[in-house]
Interface confidence: low
């Protein structure tokens, strides 16, 4: 004959374990239903009676099968600086994550704890690695042959146009101005955008070294992140 | 009104444990979340960790291996416990409020309990 | 950890000076605030989010920076200004405090 199915509550067999999603309730000595997610224990099993469950209140939740007296709290609404990518529901907590243009300086199990507006690179300066979800952008000075004129957290610095003959030579922070006839080649008409970094856990892969007219001499030059423009912590 | 009250002042034997409660008013603790501070004799300031509103706990790296921080909601206090105390751990302990969802400065400090590491 | 150096340690002031202390951070951080600590006091907060002033400090104070470099200015010392300010930032962890600014009066 096949084994009875014992009915929560009951007495586990010696050195026995409660089946899946009960508990063994010391006081009652007994094994007991769980609640499953979603609810809580209103009252816990006797020797005679099941535990009872209760739904949580609102902004509370219990993702687990579980004999909490209480439903835990869902963290506090998302602050400015964040958008809501998952909702308070009685089985969720909510999930606060950053918003475009910042990253998230201080994680928490689930979502993130702090967000800090990304880096902006100050003109003379380029996006040496573009800012993810959890980490900021890094800067670094344009090597000789290339400039950067934008205050920006995604432009990286771009070659000097090359010219027949120059007006005006260029620099860091800006283009060479080349006399009215046309320039021999213009390498990067356009400021050159990387992506956004969006929300999900993949990394983005470092920029390509921008092409140089000159011997590059970066290795000089300070390769620690920059300060942002003055006035640049975020919008 | 806003309040945090630390209890103390303390005496502490080298080599035992310090618990210190702080206990708030004026606010609900699943809503802020509580750092600890302490300030050694003509000393600066030192962050030593911080409890969260959704109970979760962040520890400075020089103290993670001998400090506790956690929290009854429903009695309003939050309970900080140190092993090991030295000499140098002689300081004033403060317990500060912080908005999880504003600005993340310590906007209310309790007055401190003065904590001497004594033989 | 980010280190933050407030320099000078000591200053002091006469009444009407103007007034500027700064704190350089070893990394670049987001945000820097300010705290205000008066002798056998708890600190209060001074200035958050780098430049905004906290509830019921003066308008003659102010704060400014980006990147690794900030500053807390008062723009008329006044007498009840004398204090010991510390900065803080928490761009990354942990949370960190500079040594302190004292600032007396003349």
């Known amino acids: 004959l096949p084994a009875q199915v014992a009915f929560t509550p009951y007495a586990p067999e010696p050195g026995s374990t409660c089946r899946l999603r009960e508990y063994y309730d010391q006081t009652a000595q007994m094994c007991c239903s769980k609640c499953s997610p979603g609810q809580h224990a209103k009252v816990f099993c006797t020797k005679t009676s099941d535990t009872v469950c209760d739904s949580c209140e609102d902004s509370t939740y219990t993702q687990l099968w579980n004999w909490v007296p209480e439903c835990l709290s869902c963290g506090s609404r998302c602050s400015s600086d964040q958008v809501e990518t998952q909702a308070c529901t009685r089985e969720q907590n909510r999930i606060c994550t950053c918003r475009p243009g910042w990253y998230c300086a201080l994680s928490k199990q689930e979502g993130c704890r702090l967000c800090a507006p990304l880096r902006k690179c100050r003109p003379g300066f380029g996006v040496a690695r573009p800012g993810t979800e959890t980490s900021d952008v890094v800067c670094k000075p344009c090597a000789p042959g290339t400039f950067s004129n934008t205050t920006s957290s995604t432009d990286i610095c771009r070659p000097h146009q090359i010219c027949n003959v120059v007006a005006i030579p260029g620099n860091a922070s800006m283009d060479a101005v080349c006399t009215s006839t046309s320039p021999t080649r213009s390498m990067a008409p356009g400021a050159v955008h990387l992506p956004q970094p969006v929300s999900t856990r993949s990394q983005h892969t470092q920029p390509t070294p921008e092409p140089s007219t000159a011997p590059s001499t970066s290795f000089l030059l300070p390769m620690g992140p920059s300060p942002p423009a003055e006035g640049s912590t975020g919008d | 009104e806003v309040q945090l009250q630390e209890s103390g002042p303390v005496l502490v034997q080298p080599s035992q444990s310090l618990s210190i409660t702080c206990t708030v008013s004026?606010?609900?603790?699943?809503?802020?979340?509580v750092h600890w501070v302490r300030q050694s004799p003509g000393k600066g300031l030192e962050w030593l960790g911080v409890?969260?509103?959704?109970?979760?706990?962040d520890y400075s790296a020089a103290f993670i291996s001998r400090l506790s921080i956690s929290k009854d909601n429903s009695k309003s206090q939050v309970f900080f416990k140190m092993n090991s105390l030295q000499a140098d751990d002689t300081a004033i302990y403060y317990c500060?409020?912080?908005?999880?969802?504003?600005?993340?400065?310590?906007?209310?400090w309790g007055q401190g309990t003065t904590v001497t590491v004594s033989s | 950890e980010i280190v933050l150096t407030q320099s000078p340690a000591l200053m002091s002031a006469s009444p009407g000076e103007k007034v500027t202390m700064t704190c350089s951070a070893s990394s670049s951080v987001s945000y820097m605030y300010w705290y205000q600590q008066k002798p056998r006091s708890s600190p209060k907060p001074w200035i958050y989010l780098t430049s905004n002033l906290a509830s019921g400090v003066p308008a003659r104070f102010s704060g400014s920076g980006s990147g690794t470099s900030y500053s807390l200015t008062i723009s008329s010392m006044e007498a009840e200004d004398a204090a010991t300010y510390y900065c803080q930032q928490w761009s990354s962890n942990p949370l960190t405090f500079g040594a302190g600014t004292k600032l007396e009066i003349k």
């Open positions: 409890i969260w509103s959704d109970g979760g706990t």
């Open positions: 004026g606010f609900s603790l699943t809503s802020y979340s």
């Open positions: 500060a409020r912080n908005d999880d969802g504003g600005d993340y400065a310590m906007d209310y």
